[in-house]
Interface confidence: low
């Protein structure tokens, strides 16, 4: 059964998915698709990585984490009710039927108040950094992703501000994780 994640209309939704690359720079292809994971590949692909790069993505779908270290969590920007549904994160491990498949259910709720887009963007860009720093060494050795500069005080402040929000609940550390190699 799929894990459920929630976001409000106008927010950025975060769908966690992780794996541990066997070696630095030796990545496993990953695809994200709308709809439950089929037998092979992803249906309705919204984003794809190969052994090196994010090589395909569509508008509003991003990887904000350090995908080179296995954080392939999906961010969906400025969600609408139509974004509700099942999403498939597929870690495409070489070999027949070796793929790891994770189905994540996204539930979009109507906005209670008018969202502040700029502020929301800052929040959702910050949290993936906080999560992906775990076990990855100091922030200055992180690889690319156009992440904002943020210190522990800012993270603590953001966490306090979001403690009671649905977003904070969505960011709980229960994402799909797999170790390879």
């Amino acid at each position: 059964s799929e894990v459920e994640y929630r976001a409000e209309v106008g927010q950025n939704a975060y769908l966690p998915c992780f794996y541990t690359p066997a070696a630095p720079g030796n990545l496993v292809p990953v695809c994200w698709g709308k709809g439950a994971c089929p037998v092979f590949e992803c249906g309705n692909v919204v984003l794809r990585t190969d052994e090196r790069d994010v090589n395909y993505w569509t508008s509003r779908y991003w990887l904000n984490g350090d995908f080179r270290k296995g954080d392939v969590s999906l961010t969906i920007e400025n969600v609408t009710l139509a974004d509700s549904g099942i999403y498939c994160c597929r870690i495409q491990i070489p070999g027949i039927m070796n793929d790891e498949k994770f189905n994540l259910k996204l539930v979009i709720k109507p906005a209670k108040v008018t969202p502040a887009p700029t502020r929301q963007r800052d929040f959702t860009a910050a949290f993936p950094r906080m999560l992906t720093t775990r076990g990855h060494g100091p922030a200055e050795t992180q690889t690319l992703g156009s992440l904002p500069d943020i210190n522990l005080t800012q993270i603590s402040t953001l966490a306090n501000e979001l403690r009671d929000s649905r977003l904070a609940n969505d960011l709980r550390d229960s994402g799909a994780t797999i170790r390879i190699g």
């Epitope: 720079g25 994010v54 993505w57 200055e140 050795t141 992180q142 690319l144």
Partner: antibody, heavy 119, light 107 residues
Framework: EVQLQQLGAELVKPGASVKISCKAS????????MDWVKQSHGESLEWIGD????????SYNQKFKGKATLTVDKSSSTAYMELRSLTSEDTAVYYC????????????WGQGTSLTVSS | TWGMTQTTSSLSASLGDRVTISCRAS??????LNWYQQKPDGTVKLLIY???RLYSGVPSRFTGSGSGTDYSLTISNLEQEDIATYFC?????????FGAGTKLELK
């Protein structure tokens, strides 16, 4: 055709600030990060930082924090770099360069803006 | 900051020569190594990315190789238009860093 258009030269007095522009065309501006690179005296290249126009998120080289501020105007597909408290050390050619999302290389470069700081 | 060293600052060669330019990283950069060409007028172009991938529109006489900390760019049959300065750049870690450049001149 992808183009990154920069002004050829700027002459500024020490202590002043300057805002260098980079107008992008030929692609969807928000689909790529815009990076800035410094080249002093025709020598090596130094990465200053980047801005992701889609998220307005930034990464800076620690060396240039407090010196450079990166911004974008999405309506005109233009990236800006403001340099403050200018000294002769800031005299250089400054390039804007396009970097694909998730990529680590710059696939298109502006022609560079030559900044001279002199009284 | 991860240092990138191009030990040869200038190199003289003749048209038709095979030229190799080297670049060394201070640590393993996992093949995240890119090469750029800068013409005398300041124009910069991407040649090779991820060590050995030829960028679109770049002539096949340019090839890249290497792994770990040691990388090289080879021009198999030097042409007049190749006279330029060549920079390597690591993309493994922020901040992105460049080599000092190797200026290629005609003998």
């Amino acid at each position: 055709e992808v183009q990154l258009q920069q002004l050829g030269a700027e002459l500024v007095k020490p202590g002043a600030s300057v805002k260098i522009s980079c107008k992008a065309s030929g692609y969807i501006f928000t689909d790529y990060s815009m990076d800035w690179v410094k080249q002093s005296h025709g020598e090596s290249l130094e990465w200053i930082g980047d801005i992701n126009p889609n998220y307005d998120s930034l990464s800076y080289n620690q060396k240039f924090k407090g010196k450079a501020t990166l911004t974008v105007d999405k309506s005109s597909s233009t990236a800006y770099m403001e340099l403050r408290s200018l000294t002769s050390e800031d005299t250089a050619v400054y390039y804007c360069a396009r970097r694909g999302y998730g990529k680590d290389y710059f696939d298109f470069w502006g022609q560079g803006t030559s900044l001279t700081v002199s009284s | 900051t991860w240092g990138m060293t191009q030990t040869t600052s200038s190199l003289s060669a003749s048209l038709g020569d095979r030229v190799t330019i080297s670049c060394r990283a201070s640590q393993d950069i996992s093949n995240y190594l890119n090469w750029y060409q800068q013409k005398p007028d300041g124009t910069v172009k991407l040649l090779i990315y991820h060590t050995s991938r030829l960028y679109s529109g770049v002539p096949s006489r340019f090839t890249g190789s290497g792994s770990g900390t040691d990388y090289s760019l080879t021009i198999s049959n030097l042409e007049q238009e190749d006279i330029a300065t060549y920079f390597c750049q690591q993309g493994n870690t922020l901040p992105l860093t460049f080599g000092a450049g190797t200026k290629l001149e005609l003998k």
